[in-house]
């Protein structure tokens, strides 16, 4: 059986302040069952940006319908980008459990924020 891979195709993305940023992520397998989560940063301060199954993330929307069967596109769109949103974002696959167990992370996409065009 093929090993699960989490693919973040872009190493970096640059967005003007006030615009939306799309962060792309796909998985190569639906197995094992479990959610995708998006984080900014690594280590103790790793910040949860989006959880596929729970939580309230008003500025973040999935690009594809997460309820759709066989969906393997876990890309997200973050609206109204500000300089404070800069950083490296990671798409991470978890195995369902109590608690969920981290399986595989994408390589990360660095988001940089350009000044708003005048």
């Amino acid at each position: 059986e093929e090993e699960l891979q989490v693919i973040q195709p872009e190493k970096s993305v640059s967005v003007a302040a006030g615009e939306s940023a799309t962060l792309n992520c796909t998985a190569t397998s639906l197995i094992p069952v479990g959610p995708i989560q998006w984080f900014r940063g690594v280590g103790p301060g790793r910040e949860l940006i989006y959880h596929q199954k729970e939580g309230h993330f008003p500025r973040v929307t999935p690009v594809s319908d997460p309820t759709k069967r066989n969906n393997m596109d876990f890309s997200i769109r973050i609206s109204n980008i500000t300089p404070a949103d800069a950083g490296t974002y990671y798409c991470v696959k978890f195995r369902k459990g109590s608690p969920d167990v981290e399986l595989k992370s994408g390589a990360g996409t660095e988001l940089s924020v350009r000044a708003k065009p005048s």
């Epitope: 989560q37 984080f39 900014r40 940063g41 690594v42 280590g43 103790p44 301060g45 790793r46 910040e47 949860l48 940006i49 939580g55 309230h56 950083g87 991470v92 608690p99 981290e102």
Partner: antibody, heavy 117, light 108 residues
């Protein structure tokens, strides 16, 4: 406004246990890393432990195996269970919010732990 | 473990003057260095992160610079409320996160 309020400090004997709590408000607690940093009397700052937004835990070598960090996201509370306490654990223990880039942007006022026979 | 050495231990400065504090790392921290201020009986307060980015609400008289292993916190036009202990912290390697030993800025 972000607020962090520690409690649970006190005086204990060597070998005893204590549990510290940190009540957080003013931000979405479950999304962020939280940490404990201590300061022995008249000394500098020492990082003790952290819990990431995904629940991963991290410890300084000096407390590994004796201290356990945990969090209750439903109660917006961070904990530090301290077992087998030693005289050198005597310090003010600060609860701090950790940014995505691993520095500390908000701190509580601290709670004093004294380990003495 | 990345070790941070701060110098001097104590700095005596007159109000209105400039204070220059140094933090040296035992290895390259890729610019991930923060500075905190701590007054007696108070919790630390974040001043600077990522070498030179001021935290919210921090006055412009506080500035950070440096690269590689050597970093500087400069306070221009010292005010009475700036007399305190200052700590650096590297946020490059989290195993473990480490602080410098501190520099006390006192009134001359």
């Amino acid at each position: 406004d972000v607020q962090l309020v520690e409690s649970g400090g006190g005086v204990v004997r060597p070998g005893e246990s204590l549990r510290l709590s940190c009540a957080a408000s003013g931000f979405t607690f479950r999304n962020y890393g939280m940490s404990w940093v201590r300061q022995a009397p008249g000394e500098g700052l020492e990082w003790v432990s952290a819990s990431s937004g995904s629940g991963s835990t991290y410890y300084a070598d000096s407390v590994k195996g004796r201290f356990t960090i945990s969090r209750d996201n439903s109660k917006n509370t961070l904990y530090l269970q301290m077992n087998s306490l030693r005289a050198e654990d005597t310090a003010i223990y600060y609860c701090a919010k950790v940014t995505w880039n691993n520095f500390f942007d908000y701190w509580g006022l601290g709670t004093l732990v004294t380990v003495s026979s | 473990e990345i070790v941070l050495a701060q110098s001097p231990d104590t700095l005596s400065v007159s109000p209105g003057e400039r204070a220059t504090l140094t933090c040296r790392a035992s290895q390259d921290v890729a610019g991930k260095l923060a500075w905190y201020q701590q007054k007696p009986g108070q919790a630390p307060r974040l001043l600077i992160h990522a070498t030179s980015s001021r935290a919210d609400g921090i006055p412009a008289r506080f500035s950070g610079s440096g690269s590689g292993t050597e970093f500087t916190l400069t306070i221009t036009g010292l005010q009475s409320e700036d007399f305190a202990v200052y700590y650096c912290q590297q946020h490059y390697d989290w195993s473990p996160l480490t602080f410098g030993g501190g520099t006390k800025v006192e009134i001359k």
